[in-house]
């Protein structure tokens, strides 16, 4: 199964991924790629970690903002656009024979709701609205155009609207 994360255009998207270095400080190479995890490595790599460095960062919008020295390799994509939608692979390259941990996370970027946020609303929508999916793996992101993005259902819209209202945001209808 896959977890789906929702972000609004222009917001930051947060895709969680982590492991526990064993022993502490024994870091494992990690790659993030756009597209479901292939046989080896990542497809369309957006960044890698190697020891204590972040390499192959293909855009300045991709960040590991957590403490990746402690195994938090969650990806933040700043200022997302519809083109950022798709499946992302977080691959933790644990040494050994076919030991890699593969995690596919789906990012859905939606157009902004007609909302005037209150100053107190300071969080990424992706962390507020993770959603479990029971579908199988999805393919490389380049095959998924914005025109084929999944619809966001009414329940999600109502949840989003209510949470924004609860936070003190002004909602225009």
């Amino acid at each position: 199964s896959e977890v789906e994360y929702i972000a609004e255009v222009g917001q930051n998207a947060y895709l969680p991924c982590s492991y526990t270095p064993a022993p502490p400080g024994n870091l494992v190479p990690v790659c993030w790629g756009k597209g479901a995890c292939p046989v080896f490595d990542c497809s369309n790599v957006v960044l890698r970690t190697e020891n204590r460095d972040v390499n192959d960062r293909t855009s300045g919008r991709y960040w590991l903002k957590g403490d990746f020295h402690k195994g938090d390799v969650s990806l933040t994509i700043e200022n997302v656009t519809l083109a950022d939608s798709g499946v992302y692979c977080c691959r933790i390259q644990i040494p050994g024979i076919m030991n890699d941990e593969k995690h596919n996370l789906k990012l859905v970027v939606i157009k902004p709701a007609k909302v005037t946020p209150a100053p107190t609303l300071q969080r990424d929508l992706t962390s507020a609205f993770p959603r479990m999916l029971t579908t199988g793996e999805h393919g490389p992101a380049e095959t998924q155009t914005p025109g084929s993005l999944p619809d966001v259902n009414l329940t999600q819209i109502f949840t989003l609207t209510n949470e924004l209202r609860d936070s003190g945001a002004t909602i225009r209808t």
Epitope: T58, D100, P140
Partner: antibody, heavy 123, light 107 residues
């Protein structure tokens, strides 16, 4: 110029062992995944094993992983395949291949191949 | 394992012909497909990766298309040097698997 040169093939009896080598030149060897692919006489291609950049991660065809071991020595720009308990069905040309790489790509297809070395398992 | 089935197994054609070879995967592999060309006694040569991207130095008469389970390799106008065996390879699921090959012969 990228070059991959395999060696170590030959005639071996069933149950015997061989160690294949692949000498790489013309590129930064430690930047690339490397792979062994084999081709039985008159047959198609079959993936055997792959290894990541620094040798810490290895991948095998399930039916071979108890008998074959892939390794690399980046200081010597060399790839190896240790083959034990050889069987007649292991008879094939064994190719060393480089995983394609460019900035931000993945190494799941192979852009340079050696000329191959023939392994014959027969009594 | 993901099975890759090529058709036809062999094909006779003439210089200048347009030729299409198909490759079908036993399950969805999205765009994770590669095409190789192999001539007798030689190593395979990378032609197309990610279903449709032409490898460096490959003539533009070669093209690839498809996604999901059905893929095609097209040669728009056969040249004498194109007579060879062509293989597809998927790289979505472990293990990597190849099609059985399509032998392209001179008519």
């Amino acid at each position: 110029e990228v070059q991959l040169v395999e060696s170590g093939g030959g005639l071996v009896k069933p149950g015997g062992s061989l160690r294949l080598s692949c000498a790489a030149s013309g590129f930064t060897f430690s930047d690339y995944y490397m792979t062994w692919v084999r081709q039985a006489p008159g047959k198609g291609l079959e993936w055997v094993s792959s290894i990541n950049y620094d040798g810490r991660n290895t991948y095998y065809l399930d039916s071979l992983k108890s008998r074959f071991t892939i390794s690399r020595d980046n200081a010597k720009n060399s790839l190896y395949l240790q083959m034990n308990s050889l069987r007649a069905e292991d008879t094939a040309v064994y190719y060393c291949a480089r995983g394609y790489y460019y900035y931000g790509s993945s190494p799941n297809y192979f852009d340079y191949w050696g000329q191959g070395t023939l392994v014959t398992v027969s009594s | 394992d993901i099975q890759m089935t090529q058709s036809p197994s062999s094909l006779s054609a003439s210089v200048g012909d347009r030729v299409t070879i198909t490759c079908r995967a036993s399950e969805n592999i999205y765009s994770y497909l590669t095409w190789y060309q192999q001539k007798p006694g030689k190593a395979p040569k990378l032609l197309i990766y990610n279903a449709k991207t032409l490898a460096e130095g490959v003539p533009s008469r070669f093209s690839g298309s498809g996604s999901g389970t059905d893929f095609t390799l097209t040669i728009s106008s056969l040249q004498p040097e194109d007579f060879a065996t062509y293989y597809c390879q998927q790289h979505y699921g472990t293990p990597l698997t190849f099609g059985q090959g399509t032998k392209l012969e001179i008519k």
